[in-house]
């Protein structure tokens, strides 16, 4: 069956270059036109570039024209996107997508590869407790959590009590701070009566920096 | 370039409902229109092409129609697997423009948020920064307004919000709003409050604390 396998994404500094690859199998590569489409975090789909099956026709979105170059190697069944002079606004998941026969809609898609354009360097998070108190208690339910702050790049994973606690957990999508670093909160609601007896630990893992933190969250002692 | 305008941006519906999404082109594209479905973290999936031709393997409840500049995608009887984001795409011209997307969400019953506030930890204050977190838990619909007040003065530009995806079990959302200050600024003030407005609340709910007090 048709398969498009992408590689080459990663973190890159503004102004630098990156090359994405899209390796095709399950069809005669040289007969098909393939496009690049991208999706910025939390945004819609944006068409980026196309190269015709014979290489004669290349076309680019205005936003990338003059900076990105599409190419293909039929002997390797691979399509490329060379991205130069990268900007923070180029941060997105990039997809390669194959057309159906000669009609220019996208019947087959790659799995996507994330490109992050940032001047930030890899950094592990600081993990701070969001301690339960009378201000975070409502009708027999208490809320507590962990603030996972100032890390780069995405993602971090958060579990509670090594995965034993899942009910009532909300781990929020990360926000990009003005510093260029990410921050997120993970919270859990528990019975107020359990605060004195049950231990609550958030387990934070940031693989890019090889950082693991286990933070115990307990009521503030006054 | 041909611009594609989709409406609505969000659509709340229940299983079994008939739902319709509209896509308008800024100039005629004949029937050169495709529709895609996308779920979080996944690549888009082709549903429909040439405005009304169903892609192989796509259920017949998906119905496409239209030509020229006006197009619709109808789901005749919404199924649990259909809650996703839908995009139209014109392929009449070189720039294969997409619509901005329509998110089809589960229509829940109104639930007012439970509101909690968290002061910055002593550990964080030692680092020179103070983050105050306001949590809005398990509410529906998604629209909620959070305002920060410090000694009753409205804050702007120094907070960030994040909202969860809709909960698959109870259809609610949760939101965190984080007010970030320097330690020096934090220690200049006493009363920190987040005020929450939501359609399920007859009046705004305010949660607050006095700095330094338990």
């Amino acid at each position: 069956q048709v398969q498009l396998v992408q590689s080459g994404g990663g973190v890159v500094q503004p102004g630098r270059s990156l090359r994405l690859s899209c390796a095709a199998s399950g069809f005669t590569f040289s007969r098909y036109t393939i496009h690049w489409v991208r999706q910025a975090p939390g945004k819609g789909l944006e068409w980026v570039a196309v190269m015709s099956y014979n290489g004669n026709n290349k076309h680019y979105a205005d936003s990338v024209n003059g900076r990105f170059t599409i190419s293909r190697n039929d002997s390797k069944n691979t399509l490329y996107l060379n991205m130069n002079s990268l900007r923070p606004e180029d941060t997105a998941v990039y997809y390669c997508a194959r057309i159906r026969d000669t009609a220019m809609f996208f019947a087959h898609w790659g799995q996507g590869t994330l490109v992050t354009v940032s001047s930030a360097s890899t950094k592990g998070p600081s993990v701070f407790p969001l301690a339960p108190s009378s201000k975070s208690t409502s009708g027999g339910t208490a809320a507590l959590g962990c603030l996972v702050k100032d890390y780069f790049p995405e993602p971090v994973t958060v579990s509670w009590n090594s995965g034993a606690l899942t009910s009532g957990v909300h781990t929020f999508p990360a926000v990009l701070q003005s510093s260029g670093l990410y921050s997120l909160s993970s919270v859990v609601t528990v019975p107020s009566s359990s605060l004195g007896t049950q231990t609550y630990i958030c387990n934070v893992n940031h693989k890019p920096s090889n950082t693991k933190v286990d933070k115990k969250v307990e009521p503030k002692s006054c | 370039d041909i611009q594609m305008t989709q409406s609505p941006s969000t659509l709340s519906a229940s299983v079994g409902d008939r739902v319709t999404i509209t896509c308008r082109a800024s100039q005629s594209i004949n029937t050169w229109l495709a529709w895609y479905q996308q779920k979080p973290g996944k690549a888009p999936k082709l549903l429909m092409y040439k405005a009304s031709s169903l892609e192989s393997g796509v259920p017949s409840r998906f119905i496409g129609s239209g030509s020229g500049t006006e197009f619709t995608l109808t789901i005749s009887s919404l199924q649990p697997d259909d809650f996703a984001t839908y995009y139209c795409q014109q392929y009449n011209s070189d720039s294969k423009m997409f619509g901005q997307g329509t998110k089809v969400e589960v229509k829940g019953t109104v639930a007012a948020p439970s509101v909690f506030i968290f002061p910055p930890s002593d550990e964080q204050l030692k680092s020179g920064t103070a983050s105050v977190v306001c949590l809005l838990n398990n509410f529906y619909p998604r629209e909620a307004k959070v305002q920060w007040k410090v000694d009753n003065a409205l804050q702007s530009g120094n907070s960030q919000e994040s909202v969860t995806e809709q909960d698959s079990k109870d259809s609610t959302y949760s939101l965190s709003s984080t007010l970030t200050l320097s330690k020096a600024d934090y220690e200049k003030h006493k009363v920190y409050a987040c005020e929450v407005t939501h359609q399920g609340l007859s009046s705004p709910v305010t949660k607050s604390f006095n700095r330094g007090e338990c």
Epitope: - | S12, E143, A144, K145, T197, H198, Q199, G200, L201, S202, S203
Partner: nanobody, 120 residues
Framework: QVQLQESGGGLVQAGGSLRLSCEAT????????MAWFRQAPGKEREFVAI????????YYSDSAKGRFTISRDNAKNTVYLQMNSLKPEDTAVYYC?????????????WGRGTQVTVSS
């Protein structure tokens, strides 16, 4: 000035129906969400239903869903609450409220309420 005037309340037997109306005067009805709340004796005011300006988006509380229907006539500046299969626990004062933000529940204007009593 803005006034919201509810009507249509009364005494009804369990299983019966009532239709409440709320007429808005002095208010630009366009762009305004209209909601119904209720308050039973000794209890907090609770949300019942809301209808956005377009009229195509409605939301209900758990207790109202399937039995109550909210609608609006923008030409008449009026919002309605059709209440079917009424239960004794629906007994309350019903208030209409206007949310000019159409989204966030900024209920700037309230009616004085109309009493609904459901007898068993």
């Amino acid at each position: 000035q803005v006034q919201l005037q509810e009507s249509g309340g009364g005494l009804v037997q369990a299983g019966g129906s009532l239709r409440l109306s709320c007429e808005a005067t002095g208010l630009t009805f366009s762009g305004v969400a209209m909601a119904w709340f209720r308050q039973a004796p000794g209890k907090e005011r609770e949300f019942v239903a809301i209808i956005r300006w377009s009229g195509s988006t409605t939301y209900y509380s758990d207790s109202a869903k399937g039995r109550f229907t909210i609608s609006r006539d923008n030409a008449k500046n009026t919002v309605y609450l059709q209440m079917n299969s009424l239960k004794p626990e629906d007994t309350a004062v019903y208030y209409c409220a206007a949310d000019p933000s159409d989204r966030f529940g900024e209920y700037d204007y309230w009616g004085r309420g109309t009493q609904v009593t459901v007898s068993s």
